[in-house]
C-alpha cells in the first residue's frame, strides 16, 4: 500500500543509521519528475536542512544543506542509475564523515557532513514519486 | 474530496474554452513546490505539449511548448500572485491568439499560440499540489 506524499517522519540519526526508501517515479523521464529527500533540524518543514537530496530523473542529482535559512554550496552529479517507470530502492547510510547513498544496492552518491547528523529531527520524502516503504534503522549499541 | 495527482483528462479545446483548476501547494514556498499544467497532443504523457505552464511557487513561472519532442523558446515571468499555503483558482482561457491565465480572478500570464489549440487531446495537472477541482468548459455554439 502507498504512503502519503509528502511523507514526514520524526527521526534521530547517528553514525550507523540507515534511511531506506522504496518508490517509483510518477511520470516518464522525458517530463522530468523529481524526488526529494530532506533531513530537517526540526519537525517544521521551514527548518534548516542538514542533507538535501534531489533527483531530477534523467537529468541530475543535487545535494546541499540549508543553514540559518540559506542554501549553501550545491554538489551536483550526473550519475543516473534510476530507470524510467521502475521501482527504486534508495538507502542513505550515515558514515562517520559522510552520507552514502545507495540506489538499488549500488553506491551512487556521497555527501560530506556539514552539520552533525545528530541534529536531524525529521525526514521528509516528497515530489513526483509514489512511496511504498520508509524505514529508519538504528545501529544496535 | 481530492483528485488524484498527477491528474489526466481527455480534452478538446478551441477559442472560448476554459480550463479551471483549484488546488493548494503541498509545501511552504521556502521549499519551492511546483505546479505544472500540460496541454498534450495525445493521451500519452510522452506526446508533444501545446502549452506547458509550470509554477515554481515563490520564484517564477515558465511557459513553453514541446514540438516534435523538443522544447522550444521558454517564456518566463516573475509575477507571483499565488500565496503560501493558500488555495488557488487557476483558469486558462483559450483566446483567438493566445492562452490567458487567471489566478484568483486576476489576469496574470499570457502565452501566444504556437500550435492551434484544436491539437490538444489531453490535459495533465501534476507536481506538488493537492487538487480539488478540474473542469473544462466549452463555448456554447
Amino acid at each position: 500500500s502507498l504512503l502519503p506524499v509528502p511523507y514526514t517522519e520524526a527521526a534521530s540519526l547517528s553514525t550507523g543509521s540507515t534511511v531506506t526508501i522504496k518508490g517509483r517515479p510518477l511520470a516518464c523521464f522525458l517530463n522530468e519528475p523529481y524526488l526529494q529527500v530532506d533531513f530537517h533540524t526540526e519537525m517544521k518543514e521551514e527548518s534548516d536542512i542538514v542533507f538535501h537530496f534531489q533527483v531530477c530523473f534523467g537529468r541530475r542529482v543535487v545535494m546541499n544543506s540549508r543553514e540559518y535559512g540559506a542554501w549553501k554550496q550545491q554538489v551536483e552529479s550526473k550519475n543516473m542509475p534510476f530507470q524510467d517507470g521502475q521501482e527504486f530502492e534508495l538507502s542513505i547510510s550515515v558514515l562517520p564523515d559522510k552520507y552514502q547513498v545507495m540506489v538499488n544496492g549500488q553506491s551512487s552518491y556521497t555527501f560530506d557532513h556539514r552539520i552533525k547528523p545528530e541534529a536531524v529531527k525529521m525526514v521528509q520524502v516528497w515530489r513526483d514519486i509514489s512511496l511504498t516503504k520508509f524505514n529508519v534503522s538504528y545501529l544496535k549499541r | 474530496s481530492l483528485l488524484p495527482v498527477p491528474y489526466t483528462e481527455a480534452a478538446s479545446l478551441s477559442t472560448g474554452s476554459t480550463v479551471t483548476i483549484k488546488g493548494r501547494p503541498l509545501a511552504c514556498f521556502l521549499n519551492e513546490p511546483y505546479l505544472q499544467v500540460d496541454f498534450h497532443t495525445e493521451m500519452k504523457e510522452e506526446s508533444d505539449i501545446v502549452f506547458h505552464f509550470q509554477v515554481c511557487f515563490g520564484r517564477r513561472v515558465v511557459m513553453n511548448s514541446r514540438e516534435y519532442g523538443a522544447w522550444k523558446q521558454q517564456v518566463e515571468s516573475k509575477n507571483m500572485p499565488f500565496q503560501d499555503g493558500q488555495e488557488f483558482e487557476l483558469s486558462i482561457s483559450v483566446l483567438p491568439d493566445k492562452y490567458q491565465v487567471m489566478v484568483n480572478g486576476q489576469s496574470s500570464y499570457t502565452f501566444d499560440h504556437r500550435i492551434k489549440p484544436e491539437a490538444v487531446k489531453m490535459v495533465q495537472v501534476w507536481r506538488d499540489i493537492s487538487l480539488t477541482k478540474f473542469n473544462v468548459s466549452y463555448l456554447k455554439r
Partner: nanobody
Framework: ELQVVESGGGLVQAGDSLRLSCAVS????????MMWFRQAPGKEREFVAA???????YCANSVKGRCTISRDNAKDTVYLQMNSLKPEDTAVYFC???????????????WGKGTLVTVSS
C-alpha cells in the same frame, strides 16, 4: 523515424582506449534517451551505458570507471569512450534510442547495425 549508425570500432590492444560514435538522423533526436549495448559471440546482448535526453548518465558495473558516455545534440551524435580495454570487451557494440530511460534491450525503439570492437592481448 530515427536512423542510427555506429562507427569507430576496430582492432585495439589490451589497455588501449577507443571512442565509438553513434550518428542519429531524425528531428526528434534530442528527446530520445540513448544507450549502448554489446554482444559477444555466443552471448546475450548486454547493457553498457546510457545517457538520458537531459544528460544524466550511467555505466554498467562491467565498465564502471572505464566508461564515459556523452552526447552532442547539435550534431545528433552520441559517444562512448572506453578506456583500459580488456580482451573480454571484445564484442559488437550497438547504439539504441528509446523514449524510456531503461537498461533493457527489449525496451529500445531504434537500433543501429553495430560496430565490431576486437581487443587483442
Amino acid at each position: 523515424e530515427l536512423q542510427v549508425v555506429e562507427s569507430g570500432g576496430g582492432l585495439v590492444q589490451a589497455g588501449d582506449s577507443l571512442r565509438l560514435s553513434c550518428a542519429v538522423s531524425g528531428r526528434t533526436f534530442s528527446s530520445y534517451h540513448m544507450m549502448w549495448f554489446r554482444q559477444a559471440p555466443g552471448k546475450e546482448r548486454e547493457f553498457v551505458a546510457a545517457i538520458a535526453w537531459r544528460g544524466g548518465t550511467y555505466c554498467a558495473n562491467s565498465v564502471k570507471g572505464r566508461c564515459t558516455i556523452s552526447r552532442d545534440n547539435a550534431k545528433d551524435t552520441v559517444y562512448l569512450q572506453m578506456n583500459s580495454l580488456k580482451p573480454e570487451d571484445t564484442a559488437v557494440y550497438f547504439c539504441a534510442a528509446s523514449l524510456r530511460y531503461v537498461f533493457d534491450p527489449s525496451a529500445m525503439d531504434y537500433w543501429g547495425k553495430g560496430t565490431l570492437v576486437t581487443v587483442s592481448s
